[in-house]
C-alpha cells in the first residue's frame, strides 16, 4: 500500500483526495552507483538472443524518452554465429511507472501510468505442443 | 522535455517551484492489455540463463514492492540440462522511476528517484582477455 501515518512536517493534503493526489518533486535523485559495470555492458550485442534498441518518444509522458528492445532474431545465435531456430529469442518485459500529463498539455498535473517495456532479450526453449 | 504550456483547465502551480513540483494522481492507469501472455510467461524457467525472482520491499517507496531477478548460474544451460561455463548468464538491468517519500513518512509528498533493477537474465559470450 502507499499510505503512511501523517507527520506534522508534511505538506497538507485535503482528505477528500487523500492519498490519491500527491505532490511530487521532479528533481530526480539517482540511487545508482556512479559507475555500474553491468549497466555499461554490451550485452545487447554479445547475447545469444541479441537485440536492438529503439528510442520511443512521447512528449505527454515523463520521462518523454524510453529506449525499447527488439530481438534481432526469432531463434538464438549459436557459437558458430548461425541462428538456431530450435530455440527462441524472446523479449524480457518489465512493467514500469511513468507520469502521463492529465489533463493533456498541463505542465504540472500528471497521472501515474503503468506501461510495459521490453528491456532486452533472452533465449528460451520453445514450448512444444504434441498432437495426440 | 518535461513541461507543457499552461492550460486554463490545469491545476495551479506556484511559479517558484514550477515545473519542479507537480501534482500526481496515484489512481494508476494501466496501458497494458489485461492479460499479457509474455509477461505471465515462464521465461525465467525456460531460459538458457534462468533466474529467480526476489521480493524487494520498501515502505518509503512507491511502488513499495519490486521483484528483482538473480541469475541461477554463472554459465548457461545447454540442451542436455548441464551448465556450459564457456558462456555467462548475466542480469539485464533497467533504470526505472519510483516515488520516494520526502520528507520521510509523509503520505502525500514524494520525490522522483531513479533506481536500477535486474529484470531477467540473458546468455552472453564472455569477453576473453588475451595475455600478451
Amino acid at each position: 500500500g502507499i499510505a503512511i501515518p501523517r507527520n506534522s512536517g508534511c505538506p497538507n493534503s485535503e482528505d477528500k483526495n487523500f492519498p490519491r493526489t500527491v505532490m511530487v518533486n521532479l528533481n530526480i535523485h539517482n540511487r545508482n552507483t556512479s559507475t555500474n559495470p553491468k549497466r555499461s555492458s554490451d550485452y545487447y550485442n554479445r547475447s545469444t538472443s541479441p537485440w536492438n534498441l529503439h528510442r520511443n518518444e512521447d512528449p505527454e509522458r515523463y520521462p518523454s524518452v524510453i529506449w525499447e528492445a527488439k530481438c534481432r532474431h526469432l531463434g538464438c545465435v549459436k557459437a558458430d554465429g548461425n541462428v538456431d531456430y530450435h530455440m527462441n529469442s524472446v523479449p524480457i518485459q518489465q512493467e514500469i511507472l511513468v507520469l502521463r500529463r492529465e489533463p493533456r498539455h498541463c505542465p504540472n498535473s500528471f497521472r501515474l501510468e503503468k506501461i510495459l517495456v521490453s528491456v532486452g532479450c533472452t533465449c528460451v526453449t520453445p514450448i512444444v505442443h504434441h498432437v495426440a | 522535455g518535461i513541461a507543457i504550456p499552461r492550460n486554463s483547465g490545469c491545476p495551479n502551480s506556484e511559479d517558484k517551484n514550477f515545473p519542479r513540483t507537480v501534482m500526481v494522481n496515484l489512481n494508476i492507469h494501466n496501458r497494458n492489455t489485461s492479460t499479457n501472455p509474455k509477461r505471465s510467461s515462464d521465461y525465467y524457467n525456460r531460459s538458457t540463463s534462468p533466474w529467480n525472482l526476489h521480493r524487494n520491499e520498501d515502505p518509503e517507496r512507491y511502488p513499495s514492492v519490486i521483484w528483482e531477478a538473480k541469475c541461477r548460474h554463472l554459465g548457461c544451460v545447454k540442451a542436455d540440462g548441464n551448465v556450459d561455463y564457456h558462456m555467462n548468464s548475466v542480469p539485464i538491468q533497467q533504470e526505472i522511476l519510483v516515488l520516494r517519500r520526502e520528507p520521510r513518512h509523509c503520505p502525500n509528498s514524494f520525490r522522483l528517484e531513479k533506481i536500477l533493477v535486474s529484470v531477467g537474465c540473458t546468455c552472453v559470450t564472455p569477453i576473453v582477455h588475451h595475455v600478451a
Partner: antibody, heavy 119, light 107 residues
Framework: EVQLVQSGAEVKKPGASVKVSCKAS????????FHWVRQAPGQGLEWIGV????????AYNQNFRDRATLTADKSTSTAYMELSSLRSEDTAVYYC????????????WGQGTLVTVSS | NIVMTQSPATLSVSPGERATLSCKAS??????VGWFQQKPGQSPRLLIY???NRYTGVPARFSGSGSGTDFTLTISSLQPEDFAVYFC?????????FGQGTKLEIK
C-alpha cells in the same frame, strides 16, 4: 568537471568518409545520451542524431539516416560520428553534446570539429 | 519537422539597455524550448531550458518566457560580453530543431 573533447579538424575529398570523436570525462559516460549537431559556415544548427552509450541505442534525423553512423566505446568513454559519401555541403563544424534525458536539455557541448569537404 | 523561426535576424542595442529576442515554433512545443548563446569560434552555451528556467551559473539578467508556439529571451541590461548570436531550440520531438539565430550587436 564535465568535459567533452573532440578530435581535430579534417579535410576530405567528395565521396570520402570522416569519423569525428568526442571523449567524455567528469561523469559516468553510460548515464546520458550523446547527440550530434552540425553548423555550416554562417548557418544555424542541424541535429544529426543520438546514441545512448549505456544501451547502444541510436536514432537519426531522417536527412542523415543513410550516411551517418553513431557509435560509442565505453572502455574509453568516447562517442563517434561517422559521415560517409561526403559532399561539399557537408562542410561544417560538428558538435557532440550531452543530453539529459529526464530533464530534457543539452547541457555540455564539445568544442566542435571543422570538417571541410573540397576537391 | 518543427520549424523554429527567430526574429529579428540582427538586433542592435546599446550596452545597459534591454534586449528582447523572439522565437516562434511552427506547432506547439509546450515549453520544451532552450536558448543558447554562441560567440565566434565557440560552441553553444545553454542559458535557458524549459522556456523559463535559468541554467546553473547563468546571470539573472537573462530570462525566458513563453509556451506553445511563442517564446522570448530577454536580457534586462546588456553587458559587453552579451553581444553574440542567440539560438532557440526545441526538444519536444525529434528531429530536434534550432532557430536560425539572432545576432545581437552593439549599437
Amino acid at each position: 568537471e564535465v568535459q567533452l573533447v573532440q578530435s581535430g579538424a579534417e579535410v576530405k575529398k567528395p565521396g570520402a568518409s570522416v569519423k569525428v570523436s568526442c571523449k567524455a570525462s567528469g561523469y559516468t559516460f553510460t548515464d546520458y545520451e550523446f547527440h550530434w549537431v552540425r553548423q555550416a559556415p554562417g548557418q544555424g544548427l542541424e541535429w544529426i542524431g543520438v546514441i545512448h552509450p549505456g544501451n547502444g541505442g541510436t536514432a537519426y534525423n531522417q536527412n542523415f539516416r543513410d550516411r551517418a553512423t553513431l557509435t560509442a566505446d565505453k572502455s574509453t568513454s568516447t562517442a563517434y560520428m561517422e559521415l560517409s559519401s561526403l559532399r561539399s555541403e557537408d562542410t561544417a563544424v560538428y558538435y557532440c553534446t550531452r543530453f539529459l534525458t529526464y530533464e530534457g536539455y543539452f547541457d555540455y557541448w564539445g568544442q566542435g570539429t571543422l570538417v571541410t569537404v573540397s576537391s | 519537422n518543427i520549424v523554429m523561426t527567430q526574429s529579428p535576424a540582427t538586433l542592435s542595442v546599446s550596452p545597459g539597455e534591454r534586449a528582447t529576442l523572439s522565437c516562434k515554433a511552427s506547432q506547439s512545443v509546450s515549453i520544451d524550448v532552450g536558448w543558447f548563446q554562441q560567440k565566434p569560434g565557440q560552441s553553444p552555451r545553454l542559458l535557458i531550458y524549459h522556456a523559463s528556467n535559468r541554467y546553473t551559473g547563468v546571470p539573472a539578467r537573462f530570462s525566458g518566457s513563453g509556451s506553445g508556439t511563442d517564446f522570448t529571451l530577454t536580457i534586462s541590461s546588456l553587458q559587453p560580453e552579451d553581444f553574440a548570436v542567440y539560438f532557440c531550440q526545441q526538444d519536444y520531438s525529434s528531429p530536434y530543431t534550432f532557430g536560425q539565430g539572432t545576432k545581437l550587436e552593439i549599437k
